[in-house]
Amino acid sequence: QAGPLPKPTLWAEPGSVISWGNSVTIWCQGTLEAREYRLDKEESPAPWDRQNPLEPKNKARFSIPSMTEDYAGRYRCYYRSPVGWSQPSDPLELVMTGAYSKPTLSALPSPLVTSGKSVTLLCQSRSPMDTFLLIKERAAHPLLHLRSEHGAQQHQAEFPMSPVTSVHGGTYRCFSSHGFSHYLLSHPSDPLELIVSGSLEDPRPSPTRSVSTAAGPEDQPLMPTGSVPHSGLRRHWE
């Protein structure tokens, strides 16, 4: 029974996005009155793990020595004090990268773009995926992703940017993922440096609607043709 106790804080070190095989530590911090900590993983039998508190009893450590697919997912923690169990923490989403081979990221027509013009970043995966994520290094809100609306799997997704400003310049990578677990991502693509030249400035760039395409009939090397509907992918800003 959840009581009136304040909810604990849940976090992961070195972070919540972990490469396959790397270690990660999940921390749950409650109060000095805590007697026991419990970690629950969504869609797993509860509790996923229990730990005694570390001195001075206000937090517990849950160790994952080697990240695998089984550990990826959504976690919450609780603590028990003499008066009962706390409220659940806010969720922690533990994401594993390296689940699939890296996609390839291209800039069309070129990674050298004049301010005010358009550019499209194209992320292509080896196997069909239904989610593509575009990451910009050192951005305040770096994550942009496209998800298939009907679970239709695609080999590629386009991220158009128009009009381009200096704000768009920087280093990008993309990831791909399957719908059955958005906590499992591919290796990151090789970095793509987008270089914006010129002086047309727009302080609030707005990427246009994203498009996902099925393979073309001739010029989509080693991609199946006609196997995927042209239903678009839904864009999400995060």
Partner: antibody
């Protein structure tokens, strides 16, 4: 560290079959295609086909279709290639290789198959 | 099938000198969808498995020394070793991954002069 470790050398008679294994470690096994490549003694490389461990999907070079069969055991992170109706020209080193984006970023050490009467 | 033809078949170069290996494909490996060339280069030392050097015609694989460089587009490609080292003695293969079946060049044997 990504590793592909193949089974040992085989000597077979013409008409027999051989099954070569490739055990993967050091990466997320299910999400990467594994291909097989043939290299006859002193010759070049020839692609045989691939298997996708996640769902068992296979594709074969037409030249090997009907004679090569690729299978996967996810519980042991191992892929297998069986080559049937062996003939002398099948004498070669057979490599498994992990596909990145249709190119191969990691290779097994190779398995020598000798077909001789 | 796409036919890959390498030249020369063998090459002898002095230590510290430049080595150049060519690879020609029977059709273009340049995709108009992403402006990339679907070509890789491998190095195979005696008794060893091949090792990936270059992909997308010019992207060096992690850990590969920067004396190795790939160039070219369409149907004509080059692998250049800017300053040959003793450990570079090997057979070098190009591979197209534009279409199935995947195909390799016949190989170029690189030796020390």
């Amino acid at each position: 560290e990504v590793q592909l470790v193949q089974s040992g050398a085989e000597v077979k008679k013409p008409g027999a079959s051989v099954k070569v294994s490739c055990k993967a470690s050091g990466y997320s096994f299910s999400g990467f295609y594994i291909d097989w490549v043939k290299q006859p003694p002193g010759k070049g490389l020839e692609w045989i086909g691939y298997i996708f461990p996640s769902n068992g999907e296979t594709s074969y070079n037409q030249k090997f279709k009907g004679r090569a069969t690729m299978t996967v055991d996810k519980s042991t992170s191992t892929v297998y290639m069986e080559l049937s109706s062996l003939r002398s020209e099948d004498t070669a080193v057979y490599y498994c290789a992990r596909q990145a984006f249709y190119y191969f970023d990691y290779w097994g050490q190779g398995t020598t198959v000798t077909v001789s009467s | 099938d796409i036919v890959m033809t390498q030249s020369p078949d063998s090459l002898a170069v002095s230590l510290g000198e430049r080595a150049t290996i060519n690879c020609k494909s029977s059709q273009s490996l340049l995709s108009s969808s992403n402006q990339k060339n679907y070509l890789a280069w491998y190095q195979q030392k005696p008794g060893q498995a091949p090792r990936l050097l270059i992909y997308w015609a010019s992207t060096r694989e992690s850990g590969v020394p920067d004396r190795f460089a790939g160039s070219g587009s369409g149907t004509d490609f080059t692998l250049t070793i800017s300053s040959l080292q003793a450990e570079d003695v090997a057979v070098y293969y190009c591979q197209q991954y534009y279409s199935y079946p995947l195909t390799f060049g016949q190989g170029t044997k690189l030796e020390i002069k």
